[in-house]
C-alpha cells in the first residue's frame, strides 16, 4: 500500500527576519520527509516561547545546518 | 582546542578610528560568539558587544552604540572591533574572548535540536593595548 | 560606575576561607546567571565560575560559587599565594541587553 502522500508540514510562513542568537532558545531541525518535501527549521524564543519558523536558505540556516552535519558526521558509529 | 590571537598594539590620534582584529584556531569560527571587552588603566572590565558569525548578528553595549563596529570574516576565521571618534579614555587593554557556543543534541535522532550556551567567556585573546594621544 | 556591586578589596592568610560578594538586580543576576573571573598581574582574565556553581577543567576545587537571589559569592577555601589576583563577578543583563561586570575585587594574601 502507498504511503500517503498528503503535505503535513509543520510551517505556514517562513520567517525572513534574521533571528538574534541571544533570544533564541533553541532550534528544531527537521528533515524533508514523505510529508514534507522542505527542511524545516523551527526556532522557540526565549520570551514567552514563541516559535518561529526560519528560512532554510538563508545563509545563517545554511550555515547551521553544514556545521551540524559535520557534528553528526563526528558522532555517527 | 580554540585559540584566539589578537593584533599588535596601536597608537591613535584623538578623533581617528582603530580596527583590532581576532583570530580563531582549533575549532569551528562559526559555532561560537565572539565578545569584545576593555579595561582601562586603573579600571574595571567593560563590555563592548559582540557577534555570532553563523548569525551574522552583532549586539552592542549602550554606551558604544554608534561608535563601535563589530564584524566577523568566515573564510578567514577572524573578528574585528572598529572603534570610531576616539578620546584618551579609550586608552585601554582590548580583549576578545569566546562566549556563546552551539550545542547540538539528539543529534543521531531524525529531529536534532540546536542550542546556544552562554557560559561564560572561556577562551580569552591575549590582548591589544590601544593608546591614545594627541 | 559598575552595575553590579563587589567589594574593592579582600585579604586573608594562607589556608585561609575567603568569600567574595557580588550584588545585583532582578534584571540581571536576579534572572540571568552569574559567572567569576580571575585576572592575574599581566594576564587576560581567566574564566573561574560559570553558571553560577560551575568550574570549567582545570580550575581547582578550591573555587566554589553560588548564587541567592540577586546576588553571588565566590568563595576560596583554602587560600594560597598564587590567588593574589582581581576577581570579577559578570551577569547578563535584560534591560540593557548586554552583558554587565562588578568593578573588581583585589584579593591580598597576607
Known amino acids: 500500500v502507498p504511503l500517503s502522500r498528503t503535505v503535513r508540514c509543520t510551517c505556514i510562513s517562513i520567517s525572513n527576519q534574521p533571528v538574534n542568537p541571544r533570544s533564541l532558545e533553541k532550534l528544531e531541525i527537521i528533515p524533508a520527509s514523505q510529508f514534507c518535501p522542505r527542511v524545516e527549521i523551527i526556532a522557540t524564543m526565549k520570551k514567552k516561547g514563541e516559535k518561529r519558523c526560519l528560512n532554510p536558505e538563508s545563509k545563517a540556516i545554511k550555515n547551521l545546518l553544514k556545521a551540524v552535519s559535520k557534528e553528526r558526521s563526528k558522532r555517527s558509529p | 582546542q580554540v585559540q584566539l590571537v589578537q593584533s599588535g598594539a596601536e597608537v591613535k590620534k584623538p578623533g581617528s578610528s582603530v580596527t583590532v582584529s581576532c583570530k580563531a584556531s582549533?575549532?569551528?569560527?562559526?559555532?561560537?560568539?565572539i565578545t569584545w571587552l576593555r579595561q582601562a588603566p586603573g579600571q574595571g572590565l567593560e563590555w563592548m558587544g559582540e557577534?555570532?558569525?553563523?548569525?551574522?548578528?552583532?549586539n552592542y553595549a549602550q554606551k558604544f552604540q554608534g561608535r563601535v563596529t563589530i564584524s566577523a570574516d568566515e573564510s578567514t576565521s577572524t573578528a574585528y572591533m572598529e572603534l570610531s571618534g576616539l578620546t584618551s579614555e579609550d586608552t585601554a587593554m582590548y580583549y576578545c574572548?569566546?562566549?556563546?557556543?552551539?550545542?547540538?543534541?539528539?543529534?543521531?535522532?531524525?529531529?536534532?535540536?540546536?542550542?546556544?550556551?552562554?557560559?561564560?567567556?572561556?577562551?580569552w585573546g591575549q590582548g591589544t593595548t590601544v593608546t591614545v594621544s594627541s | 560606575q559598575s552595575v553590579l556591586t563587589q567589594p574593592p578589596s579582600a585579604s586573608g592568610t594562607p589556608g585561609q576561607r575567603v568569600t567574595i560578594s557580588c550584588s545585583g538586580s532582578?534584571?540581571?543576576?536576579?534572572?540571568?546567571?552569574v559567572n567569576w573571573y580571575q585576572r592575574l598581574p599581566g594576564a587576560a582574565p581567566q574564566l573561574l565560575i560559570y553558571?553560577?556553581?560551575q568550574r570549567p577543567s582545570g580550575i581547582p576545587d578550591r573555587f566554589s560559587g553560588s548564587k541567592s537571589g540577586t546576588s553571588g559569592s565566590l568563595v576560596i577555601s583554602g587560600l594560597q599565594s598564587e590567588d593574589e589576583a582581581d576577581y570579577y563577578c559578570?551577569?547578563?543583563?535584560?534591560?540593557?541587553?548586554?552583558?554587565?561586570f562588578g568593578g573588581g575585587t583585589k584579593l591580598t594574601v597576607l
Open positions: 574572548a569566546r562566549d556563546g557556543r552551539f550545542d547540538v543534541s539528539d543529534l543521531l535522532t531524525d529531529k536534532p535540536k540546536v542550542t546556544i550556551n552562554y557560559n561564560g567567556m572561556d577562551v
Open positions: 582549533g575549532g569551528t569560527f562559526s559555532s561560537f560568539s
Open positions: 557577534i555570532t558569525p553563523m548569525f551574522g548578528i552583532a
Open positions: 532582578s534584571s540581571n543576576i536576579g534572572s540571568n546567571t
Open positions: 553558571n553560577n556553581d
Open positions: 559578570a551577569s547578563w543583563d535584560d534591560s540593557l541587553n548586554g552583558r554587565v
